[in-house]
């Protein structure tokens, strides 16, 4: 990973922001609203701070989603941009701000009273939409915490890893997200070497369980380094 | 409102391993950047590791690359901080500490706005 130019106490491993890149219309790229670091003996601010590279809309903040910056461009450029609001245009959930979520290509309210039944037919909905549900369900509705009083088993349909009994995390299946075992030591995990490879999962795997890491498995010589087996393994 | 409270702490023996957990309550963790930072005495504070909000970001100071390791469960409201090898130049109280996560950007200590009250490592040569 690439360091940012801020200081040592910076989260120095996130991707450097890009320079010039613009939102589409009705998709400002997001701005943070300034930086406080030490400058000398005062605290300047940063306000023209450009937006991270992505995979995936995890890597992005909670009000961002992670998308190409421009209709139509290089789907391998991928940034975070700011969510959109209520009754903007949408693909899929994680697009829509925190308490909403993506009906019918809308950014709607996550009402409690309405929403479990929706959520169920906007699987059915979104089968067929243009790579809208690749994503699946994400992180940003209140469903987990205003909702689901018991957390979800193996299978069941989630928007985020809270939302799933312990031992378990959401992750892609099909065009929807279930709860699926977090990886023991010595199973298969995915680790991702090249920036944008999450959006084609459709089967994703869990991350792997506490006190381990997705590392390439000792014994697994290959002439590709891309497609040594990696597996869970004790830090 | 999220109150962070670590342990796990000791001592232990140069190379020996510690595993420091901060556990959270309130409901902004699961949207808040964790990190750790640590202060030896007669330091100033410096920044240890971090993880973003979803475990999908993480970094950690040079100092500590390949030896130590952070990850979360939002589920559970902990993170945790696996320290290996560990030095005598590793002896500081560990503080955890959270702080929005609303965009992707780089945060800086005087952003991480809840704040543990620190547990002693202490690693003896």
């Known amino acids: 990973t690439l360091n940012s130019v801020l200081n040592s106490n910076a989260i120095k491993n996130l991707p450097p922001p890009l320079g010039g890149a613009a939102g589409h219309p009705g998709s400002a790229v997001s701005a943070a609203p300034g930086i406080l670091y030490p400058g000398g003996n005062k605290y300047q601010t940063i306000d023209n701070y450009q937006p991270y590279p992505c995979a995936e809309d995890e890597e992005c903040g909670t009000d961002e989603y992670c998308a190409s910056p421009t209709r139509g461009g290089d789907a391998g450029v991928q940034i975070c941009l700011a969510c959109r609001k209520r009754r903007k245009r949408c693909m899929r959930h994680a697009m829509c701000c925190p308490g909403n979520y993506c009906k019918n290509g809308i950014c709607v309210s996550s009402d409690q009273n309405h929403f479990r039944g929706e959520i169920e037919e906007t699987i059915t909905e979104s089968f067929g939409n243009d790579h809208s549900t690749l994503d699946g369900y994400s992180r940003r509705t209140t469903l987990s915490s205003k909702m689901y009083h018991t957390k979800g088993q193996e299978g069941s349909v989630c928007l985020r890893s809270s939302d799933c009994a312990s031992g378990l995390c959401c992750a892609r299946h099909f065009w929807s997200k279930i709860c699926k075992p977090v990886l023991k030591e010595g199973q298969v995990c995915t680790k991702h070497r090249r920036k944008g490879s999450h959006g084609l999962e459709i089967f994703q795997r869990c991350y792997c369980g506490e006190g381990l890491s997705c590392r390439i498995q000792k014994d697994h010589h290959q002439a590709s380094n891309s497609s040594r087996l990696h597996t869970c393994q004790r830090h | 409102e999220v109150q962070l409270v670590e342990s796990g702490g000791g001592l232990v023996q140069a190379g020996g391993s510690l595993r420091l957990s901060c556990t959270a309550s309130?409901?902004?963790?699961?949207?808040?950047?964790v990190g750790w930072f640590r202060q030896a005495p007669r330091k100033e504070r410096e920044f240890v590791t971090a993880?973003?909000?979803?475990?999908?970001?993480?970094d950690y100071a040079d100092s500590v690359k390949g030896r130590f390791t952070i990850s979360r469960d939002n589920a559970k409201n902990t993170a945790w901080l696996q320290m290996n090898s560990l030095k005598p130049e590793d002896t500081a109280v560990y503080y955890c500490?959270?702080?929005?996560?609303?965009?992707?950007?780089?945060?800086?200590?005087?952003?991480?706005?809840?704040w543990g009250q620190g547990t002693q490592v202490t690693v003896s040569s």
């Open positions: 309130g409901s902004a963790f699961s949207s808040s950047v």
């Open positions: 500490a959270a702080g929005s996560d609303r965009y992707a950007r780089v945060l800086t200590e005087y952003e991480y706005v809840w």
């Open positions: 993880i973003n909000w979803s475990g999908a970001r993480t």
